[in-house]
């Protein structure tokens, strides 16, 4: 029962995590204009992996896609790649883990196959989570570097008469969504790996051997003795759970963005 619960919970946690990684990747608020210690402007800037947006106080929002590929910073390209790899691995992991779920019966799939699939999906989730965390962290590091660079020359003067205010950017909501989502996917993956250990079918250490004592025709099966003495770690009798009628519909909603271009 504990194995099924661990596997099911791992799947659900990973599902939420991957949905979060997808949401974070699509979000426009990876970096937002720093409002602290800045002149109050009637314009608010924020940027994502795919486009940058400007929201005027009047309510008008304009978003422009990064239509160049070669002109973008290498770091941004790297972050994009990490997030996409994370999503792809996570999606494959989800697909694999659905078939690996103990509560789902597919033909005459053996427990050993389900255990392998659970381990595979678990590893995929772990790598997916790490990719997301790495991607978000690289972007955050890029922001911190740029923030302090722009703080150093906050105002660039023209002969001391006219001042140009540099827009500083700080952490956007997508970074926090990405970190949490990556963490959840990682945790879900670990849970799947733990569940895999419990799913692996027990292997009997001793083959059943017939001993013929003189004058008697009795067969002794040492396996029985072994079980009673508590030898070995995988010797407990395992119950087979039929999964019951417990079906959960996972409805995942994504944040909708309304951009008035």
């Amino acid at each position: 029962m504990a194995v099924t619960a661990c596997q099911g919970l791992g799947f659900v946690v990973s599902l939420i995590g991957i949905a979060g990684i997808i949401a974070a990747t699509c979000m426009d608020q990876w970096s937002t204009q720093d409002l602290y210690n800045n002149p109050v402007t009637a314009v608010f800037n924020y940027q994502g992996l795919w486009r940058s947006c400007v929201r005027e106080s009047s309510g008008f929002t304009e978003c422009r896609g990064y239509f160049t590929l070669l002109g973008l910073p290498a770091m941004l390209q790297a972050v994009r790649a990490l997030m996409i790899v994370g999503i792809v691995l996570g999606a494959i992991g989800l697909l694999v883990s659905i078939f690996a779920l103990k509560c789902i019966r597919i033909g005459s799939m053996e427990d050993s196959a389900k255990a392998n699939m659970t381990l595979t999906s678990g590893i995929m989730f772990i790598v997916s989570g790490l990719c997301a965390i790495a991607g978000v962290s690289v972007f955050a590091n890029m922001l911190v570097t740029n923030f302090w660079m722009s703080t150093a020359n906050m105002y660039t003067g023209m002969g001391g008469m006219v001042q140009t205010v540099q827009t500083r950017y700080t952490f956007g909501a997508a970074l926090f969504v990405g970190w949490v989502a990556g963490g959840l996917t990682l945790i879900g993956g670990v849970m799947m790996c733990i569940a895999c250990r419990g799913l692996a079918p027990e292997e009997t250490n001793y083959k059943a051997v017939s001993y013929h004592a003189s004058g008697h025709s009795v067969a002794y099966k040492p396996g029985g003795f072994k079980a009673s003495t508590g030898f070995g770690s995988n010797t407990k009798n395992k119950k087979i759970y039929d999964g019951g009628a417990r079906t959960e519909d996972e409805v995942q909603s994504y944040p909708s963005k309304h951009d008035y271009v």
């Epitope: 402007t41 800037n45 540099q166 827009t167």
Partner: antibody
Amino acid sequence: QVQLKESGPGLVAPSQTLSITCTVSGFSLTNYGVQWVRQPPGKGLEWLGVIWAGGNTNYNSALLSRLSISKDTSKSQVFLKMNSLKTDDTAMYYCARGGYGNSCDYWGQGTLVTVSA
Amino acid sequence: DIVMTQSPSSLTVTAGEKVTMNCKSSQSLLNSGNQKNYLAWYRQKPGQPPKLLIYWASTRGSGVPDRFTGSGSGTDFALTISSVQAEDLAVYYCQNDYFYPLTFGAGTKLDLK
């Protein structure tokens, strides 16, 4: 079509409070902000403040302590209140809709407020 | 506060002539996020409320004739009327739409000979 109409008291005594209402039609206050601008006789335009669609307000720093802008979205009305009036507050007061680029794309005809004893 | 300086304070021109007036801000009105300049131009005819001519420094407002052209970036802006008409007799104001408070310039008065 878009219309804005200011209604004010006309004459106000010094040290009293000025209340002007801007009634709008042709657009919703949930989607657009309203800015207030005044113009003393024979002088230039002076920006007073704004209330944006979300309800957030910004004021002219020189009038910050005396000015307050609010709105009643359901009645399509925006209110300007200015206390401790002085004679140099005598001006034509305009309300205008906040449009693209935070500019004032539609203006009311204005209401003349005279501060005099 | 941002100071908007308009020049000249008054202009006298003949109908059909091309005219240019200037506006200078004490800080750059260029937003790096969308590369737009947050400056507007208004025309105020005697006894009337102001009318929006240009926003984003160079975009004409609705119903504004194409003889009006806004230009400039950062701190220096200009409004050009390619062929002045009698109805253009007015005071022209520029406005900072980027920094609060959204200050106006003192205006340029356009007179006809």
